[in-house]
């Protein structure tokens, strides 16, 4: 289950700490790593495997790390500072407005336009039409005689927050 | 708007037990603990403790272990509290308040249900 | 448990007047990382309460600037710089620096 709050949702304005592995709050302030007790008094580390935080907090708890959907790779796994990274499995992508779910990817262009993007873990193959070079919609028509395409080798990893 | 609307009045035996709502809306119900306090008749508020609906802790008064339960419905951003072998020094009007998840930030309620009425009486 | 005193308990003002109310802590409310969790509320009749001030003169969002807060470690004043009818109700003062938190017993403002 994905988290549904990230640190970039909750993080208070961040201040420069100096660094340290436990102990306690700096200037108010629990390092990376850490959450602070229910006194204020302490820094307590997050569990490893389980939750994480990003920057110096004061958040009563660590966050959850997020678990990779099915249709999704574990590119990295989460640590005490840093949440799971997952990416769209191969063929499939994940829209920005709607980063709930991947979606497969289409398999070619409608006529009259021509491949000019890959498939990638977050965008579908792109199209422009062969004569004025514009972008098409992505709005799939409902007879579409294609261009077959083999997905596309992601540049670099999508890194998702929660 | 942010607004938390706590279940009706409710008049129990001594012994029983009593489960009040409060249900949230016009914010994010995850974003925030969910607080309860008391209010004995003509007496201050007392600090119940707190429910962390991201993540499902509880936090209490420990005066108040063993004599409230704290739960949330996350479909419904709804908080219950429930009260159990109750006595009739329960009977008082109980408040549901959010508070922020940061310490600096989290001792305070910001917006309060309109409260509920529990009288325990044989 | 950190007691919280208030003074007066009852307090009659006259509208367009000054209003001041004190609160007093068991144990200083400086936090160790240097900040003060001195909150105050209002409960107007029939009403639940409502906030005020936090951490110590911090006006929250919406409450006029008649109202304002200040004090130090034990002793804290919430002033009203000019009464209004609608100010009436019962002032707490509360605590976020110690765990658990608590209330005072509460000031009742009522029109002279």
């Known amino acids: 289950e994905s988290a549904l709050i990230t640190q970039q949702d909750l993080a208070p304005q961040q201040r420069a700490a100096p660094q340290q592995k436990r102990s306690s709050p700096s200037e108010g302030l629990c390092p990376p790593g850490h959450h602070i007790s229910e006194d204020g008094r302490d820094c307590i580390s997050c569990k490893y495997g389980q939750d994480y935080s990003t920057h110096w907090n004061d958040l009563l708890f660590c966050l959850r790390c997020t678990r990779c959907d099915s249709g999704e790779v574990e590119l990295s796994p989460c640590t005490t500072t840093r949440n799971t990274v997952c990416q769209c499995e191969e063929g499939t992508f994940r829209e920005e407005d709607s980063p709930e779910m991947c979606r497969k990817c289409r398999t070619g262009c409608p006529r009259g336009m021509v491949k000019v993007g890959d498939c990638t873990p977050w965008s579908d193959i792109e199209c422009v039409h062969k004569e004025s070079g514009t972008k098409h919609s992505g709005e799939v028509p409902a007879v579409e005689e294609t261009v077959t395409s083999s997905p596309g080798t992601p540049a670099s990893p999508c890194s998702l927050s929660g | 708007q942010v607004q938390l609307v706590q279940s009706g009045a409710e008049v129990k035996k001594p012994g029983a037990s009593v489960k009040v709502s409060c249900k949230a809306s016009g914010y994010s119900f995850i974003g925030y603990f969910m607080n309860w306090m008391k209010q004995s008749p003509g007496m201050s508020l007392e600090w119940i403790g707190r429910?962390?609906?991201?993540?499902?802790?509880?936090f209490y008064n420990q005066k108040f272990k063993g004599k409230a339960t704290l739960t949330v419905d996350k479909s419904t951003s709804t908080a219950y509290m429930e009260l159990s072998s109750l006595r009739s020094e329960d009977t008082a009007v109980y408040f549901c308040?959010?508070?922020?998840?940061?310490?600096?930030?989290?001792?305070?309620?910001?917006?309060w249900g309109q409260g509920t009425l529990v009288t325990v009486s044989s | 448990d950190i007691v919280m005193t208030q003074s007066p308990l009852s307090l009659p003002v006259t509208p367009g007047e000054p209003a001041s109310i004190s609160c007093r802590s068991s144990q200083s409310l400086v936090h160790s990382n240097g900040n003060t969790y001195l909150h105050w509320y209002l409960q107007k009749p029939g009403q639940s309460p409502q906030l005020l001030i936090y951490?110590?003169?911090n006006r929250f969002s919406g409450v006029p600037d008649r109202f304002s807060g200040s004090g130090s470690g034990t002793d804290f004043t919430l002033k009203i710089s000019r009464v209004e009818a609608e100010d009436v109700g019962v002032y707490y003062c509360?605590?976020?620096?110690?765990?658990?938190?608590?209330f005072g017993p509460g000031t009742k403002v009522e029109i002279k």
């Open positions: 509360s605590q976020s620096t110690h765990v658990p938190w608590t």
């Open positions: 429910f962390n609906p991201y993540n499902g802790d509880t």
């Open positions: 308040g959010r508070s922020a998840y940061y310490f600096d930030s989290g001792g305070y309620f910001d917006y």
């Open positions: 951490k110590v003169s």
